[in-house]
């Protein structure tokens, strides 16, 4: 094949090599960019910046090598359009630093930075951590900080991510109230901060105020849906990112729902209760307080992380006709109380029969479809032992 005269020449089925001295000053309009998986660039002293727009359209790129070139700056978002990138070699350039954001979101198996005049500061704490943790082949490079010494020796005690404190109201918050949250950000080299409110949806009207180091957030006309929803404050500096989430408790009265009893392993009278603070519960049976036992007890399902409603069952272990009746669930919190009732019939009363009717005496056969090994009771077939005391 004839030698390729262009600045960049195909290499294999999906590679490109750009090695002609000084031919590139940016990576715009590379031929066949959308299918490239490998890009090798060398001896490009005019290629000094790598930015978001340079790698747009290189979505399939896996290996990027820019060596012995003039690269001075790599933008924090430079690799946003190359999420599959797994090998990045930027050795022997003029890089003094590289932001943690540049590699965030990538799954780099290899990151080569040797031969750059790196300047040690907290901005390279993430790289020092990679070296400590043996990531990306960094330890083998024995990276040096220009004028100082091995990156491994850089003191890092003061290299922390921002510290966040979110102040929430102490007093109880009612539906319709306005709530002011304040996020206090401390730390060195603060760059950006803000709120993440994705969970809030229609829970309140949101108004942001202020900026670093004190961010304000007003949640106006709050609804009970705001409960259990995360309001997150975040901040970034040259070391990394910190997030703190808080929840605002919006008080609202207890409510309760009961559903028809269902037979599972035990019988279950399903219920749902809601309220903030969480209501206390009490069961009544035929109007009297029902004392729970190991045979009749309340059991809650695992609560959903982002809602106040609790679902559960009144569990009845092998209830008989004596358990038939009216079940009432009372729920109360400081803002109100609610109740719901339901009739439950677990078993017919065996003593309510016509003396003329024959008394069944046979056992039911075991139901072969049953998932448990216990005999399955069937109405009108179930045998009852009748003992008569004689004395």
């Amino acid at each position: 094949a004839a030698p390729c005269p262009d600045a960049c020449c195909p290499h294999g089925s999906s590679g490109l090599r750009c090695t002609r001295d000084g031919a590139l000053d940016s990576l715009h309009h590379l031929p066949g960019a959308e299918n490239l998986t490998e890009l090798y660039i060398e001896n490009q002293q005019h290629l000094q910046h790598l930015e978001l727009r340079d790698l747009r359209g290189l979505g399939e790129l896996r290996n990027l090598t820019i060596v012995k070139s003039g690269l001075r700056f790599v933008a924090p978002d430079a690799f946003h359009f190359t999420p599959r990138l797994s090998r990045l070699n930027l050795s022997f350039n003029a890089l003094e630093s590289l932001s943690w954001k540049t590699v965030q979101g990538l799954s780099l198996q290899e990151l080569v930075l040797s031969g750059n005049p790196l300047h040690c500061s907290c901005a390279l704490r993430w790289l020092q951590r990679w070296e400590e943790e043996g990531l990306g082949g960094v330890p083998e490079q024995k990276l040096q900080c220009h004028g100082q010494g091995p990156l491994a020796h850089m003191p890092n005690a003061s290299c922390g991510v921002p510290t966040l404190k979110v102040q929430v109201p102490n007093a109880s918050v009612d539906v319709g109230d306005d709530v002011l949250l304040r996020c206090q950000v401390e730390g060195r080299g603060l760059e950006q901060a803000g709120w993440i409110l994705t969970e809030l949806e229609q829970s309140a009207t949101v108004m942001k105020s202020g900026g670093l180091p004190s961010l304000g957030l007003t949640l106006a006309n709050v609804t009970s849906d705001l409960n259990r929803k995360n309001v997150t404050c975040w901040a970034e500096n040259d070391v990394g990112r910190a997030e703190v989430s808080v929840q605002v408790n919006v008080s609202f009265p207890a409510s309760v729902q009961l559903h028809t009893a269902v037979e599972m392993h035990h019988w279950c009278i399903p219920f749902s209760v809601d309220g903030q603070p969480a209501p206390s519960l009490r069961w009544l049976f035929n109007g009297s307080v029902l004392n729970e036992t190991s045979f009749i007890f309340t059991e809650f399902l695992e609560p959903a992380a982002n809602e106040t409603v609790r679902h559960g069952c009144l569990r009845l272990n092998q209830p008989t006709h004596v358990n038939n009746g009216n079940y009432t669930l009372l729920a109360a919190n400081p803002f109100g109380q609610a109740s719901a009732s339901i009739m439950a019939a677990f078993m017919d009363n065996p003593f309510e029969f016509n003396p003329e009717d024959p008394i069944p005496v046979s056992f039911s056969p075991v139901d072969t479809n049953s998932t448990s090994g216990d005999p399955v009771e069937k109405k009108d077939e179930t045998p009852f032992g009748v003992s008569v005391a004689v004395g």
């Epitope: 300047h119 220009h146 850089m154």
Partner: antibody, heavy 119, light 106 residues
């Protein structure tokens, strides 16, 4: 113990060059960056540049770019700083100092070399 | 470059006095270094990494601070402490020095 011994005072004419030496002893010369700092009479300290004797990597303050050359001789554990196109404002005491990476600071300084630029 | 501003530029004090010198960086830094220099001598390292004492430095010297504001304190000034003190940063390239604070006998 660790020592940096510098060459003697120099008097130069404007436009000339001066080469100051800094001989290191008591440690592995090639392992630590050597920096050069100067101090004009009655003034503060001003950083000039640095060299890594292990591989001759070097860098300089913008102000001295193109006028300063940093070299080293590993066989004698000596670092050199050459400043060309001298002007009267280059009159100063020139110091070499080692950057000690274990504790991350300039821990040992040479005694200084006075360079006077005068016509 | 990060600018280092020392204050005061000079001060007069007596033996036994408590002396505080401040150094402010034009942007946040991780660590600060302090040097003592006597006339005709090379700078001598006093404090490294903000608060660690250099070898052979008496405990009356102490350093503190974070972000952009740092201080050097001499708890009880001794005759040998009359000198010029410089702060220096190497958080960010290039290393830069403060303008110096001359401590003179009152």
């Amino acid at each position: 113990q660790v020592q940096l011994v510098q060459s003697g005072a120099e008097v130069k004419k404007p436009g000339a060059s001066v080469k100051v030496s800094c001989k290191a002893s008591g440690y592995t010369f090639t392992e630590y960056w050597m920096h050069w700092v100067r101090q004009a009479p009655g003034q503060g300290l001003e950083w000039i540049g640095t060299i890594y004797p292990g591989n001759s990597d070097s860098s300089f303050a913008q102000k001295f770019q193109g006028r300063v050359t940093l070299t080293r001789d590993t066989s004698t554990s000596t670092a050199y700083m050459e400043l060309s196109s001298l002007r009267s404002e280059d009159t100063a005491v020139y110091y070499c100092t080692r950057f000690y990476y274990e504790d991350w600071y300039f821990d040992v300084w040479g005694q200084g070399t006075t360079v006077t630029v005068s016509s | 470059d990060i600018q280092m501003t020392q204050s005061p530029s000079s001060l007069s004090a007596s033996v036994g006095d408590r002396v505080t010198i401040t150094c402010r960086a034009s942007s946040s830094i991780s660590y600060l270094y302090w040097f003592q220099q006597k006339p005709g001598k090379a700078p001598k390292p006093l404090i490294y990494r903000t608060s660690s004492l250099g070898s052979g430095v008496p405990s009356r010297f102490s350093g503190s601070g974070s972000g952009t504001d740092y201080t050097l304190t001499i708890s009880s000034l001794q005759p040998e402490d009359f000198a010029t003190y410089y702060c220096q940063q190497y958080h960010s390239y290039p290393p830069t020095f403060g303008g110096g604070t001359k401590v003179e006998i009152k």
